[in-house]
């Protein structure tokens, strides 16, 4: 059965997924999709990486961690009840039937009504919002939260570690800058460069 994750309407939801690159920079293509993982690919792709970069994403979905170290956890911005459901993280390891796939269930709860405005700490506070706008144009700088260099022995959702407050502090204190590729295509809602 799927591992369950929760967020409130209006918050950012975080769905963890990790793998260990065979060597630094030796990345594996990954896709995220809405719906349970089918036999190949991801049901309805919302984001994907190739061997080098994030090469396709749709609005509100991004990778806040250091995907170059194998943190391909998905952040969904400003969730609504419609974002509830199963999401697929697929690590597309080359070879014969080598893919690793994970189904993660996202449960969205209605927002709590609070009497006075207070600083909300949602469960994704450990994963800082990007400090500059996302890559809608050529070579635009994006500042992302990155995972500390922890030892990931195998692909895992690492749910326990992510609930660890020390990790949360490390994440809040770290940052990484990634340049948006100049051949991203911006069509409002979908952003990609071709995979060839």
């Amino acid at each position: 059965s799927e591992v369950e994750y929760r967020a409130e309407v209006g918050q950012n939801a975080y769905l963890p997924c990790f793998y260990t690159p065979a060597a630094p920079g030796n990345l594996v293509p990954v896709c995220w999709g809405k719906g349970a993982c089918p036999v190949f690919e991801c049901g309805n792709v919302v984001l994907r990486t190739d061997e080098r970069d994030v090469n396709y994403w749709t609005s509100r979905y991004w990778l806040n961690g250091d995907f170059r170290k194998g943190d391909v956890s998905l952040t969904i911005e400003n969730v609504t009840l419609a974002d509830s459901g199963i999401y697929c993280c697929r690590i597309q390891i080359p070879g014969i039937m080598n893919d690793e796939k994970f189904n993660l269930k996202l449960v969205i709860k209605p927002a709590k009504v609070t009497p006075a405005p207070t600083r909300q700490r949602d469960f994704t506070a450990a994963f800082p919002r990007m400090l500059t706008t996302r890559g809608h144009g050529p070579a635009e700088t994006q500042t992302l939260g990155s995972l500390p260099d922890i030892n990931l022995t195998q692909i895992s959702t690492l749910a326990n570690e992510l609930r660890d407050s020390r990790l949360a502090n490390d994440l809040r204190d770290s940052g990484a800058t990634i340049r948006g590729s100049s051949d991203y295509k911006d069509d409002d809602d979908k952003h990609h460069h071709h995979h060839h």
Epitope: A36, P38, N44, Y56, G95, D99, H195
Partner: antibody
Framework: EVKLVESGGGLVQPGGSLRLSCAAS????????MAWVRQAPGKGLEWVAN????????YYLDSLKSRFTISRDNAKNSLYLQMNSLRAEDTAVYYC???????????????WGQGTLVTVSS | DIQMTQSPSSLSASVGDRVTITCRAS??????LAWYQQKPGKAPKLLIY???TLAEGVPSRFSGSGSGTDFTLTISSLQPEDFATYYC?????????FGQGTKLEIK
């Protein structure tokens, strides 16, 4: 117009080899997973193998993966199936089919070739 | 492996009839189900994908429903060209598997 044309079938003795080819046209070949599906005479459909966009990942029916190899050449818009150590039970029409695309979503074999008959007999 | 079981195996019906073919998966396949039509000596033709989405160029008298383990293909008003064999197929687990087929014959 999407077109898939298989070739390479024929009569082969048990233990022999054949290489099937599928020429694709009318779509961006490298944007799609491709598959081979077979149908023995008077029988139902049986999936054989799939291959991803660039050929780096392959998927097989367990009982065939030691003898069959799926591959593709995106520069030639071609899909292949190398069949070794053929047996009488491999006798079938072999179809090439287009599977899911780069952005997912549509799970079904949307286009099929006309098929090529492989007969394994002494 | 996920087994796909179609029923009935064969069916006799008349032009204008409403026909329903069912397909049951041995495990949850969500909505990753396709339906195909095959005529003798021809390649299969995709009718429905993702359990209920009509493939391009397929007449609206064909419809699909279901999710999880139980699925249905319905032909609302049989036409002469609809007499053929119909297969369901799952795209959720490896290996991909087909139902054994339902032969639709003229009564």
């Amino acid at each position: 117009e999407v077109k898939l044309v298989e070739s390479g079938g024929g009569l082969v003795q048990p233990g022999g080899s054949l290489r099937l080819s599928c020429a694709a046209s009318g779509f961006t070949f490298s944007d799609y997973y491709m598959a081979w599906v077979r149908q023995a005479p008077g029988k139902g459909l049986e999936w054989v193998a799939n291959i991803n966009y660039d050929g780096s990942s392959t998927y097989y029916l367990d009982s065939l993966k030691s003898r069959f190899t799926i591959s593709r050449d995106n520069a030639k818009n071609s899909l292949y199936l190398q069949m070794n150590s053929l047996r009488a039970e491999d006798t079938a029409v072999y179809y090439c089919a287009r599977d899911v695309g780069y952005y997912g979503g549509n799970y079904g074999f949307a286009y099929w070739g006309q098929g090529t008959l492989v007969t394994v007999s002494s | 492996d996920i087994q796909m079981t179609q029923s009935p195996s064969s069916l006799s019906a008349s032009v204008g009839d409403r026909v329903t073919i069912t397909c049951r998966a041995s495990d949850n396949i969500y909505s990753y189900l396709a339906w195909y039509q095959q005529k003798p000596g021809k390649a299969p033709k995709l009718l429905i994908y993702n359990a209920k989405t009509l493939a391009e160029g397929v007449p609206s008298r064909f419809s699909g429903s279901g999710s999880g383990t139980d699925f249905t293909l319905t032909i609302s008003s049989l036409q002469p060209e609809d007499f053929a064999t119909y297969y369901c197929q799952q795209h959720y687990g490896s290996p991909l598997t087909f139902g054994q087929g339902t032969k639709l014959e003229i009564k």
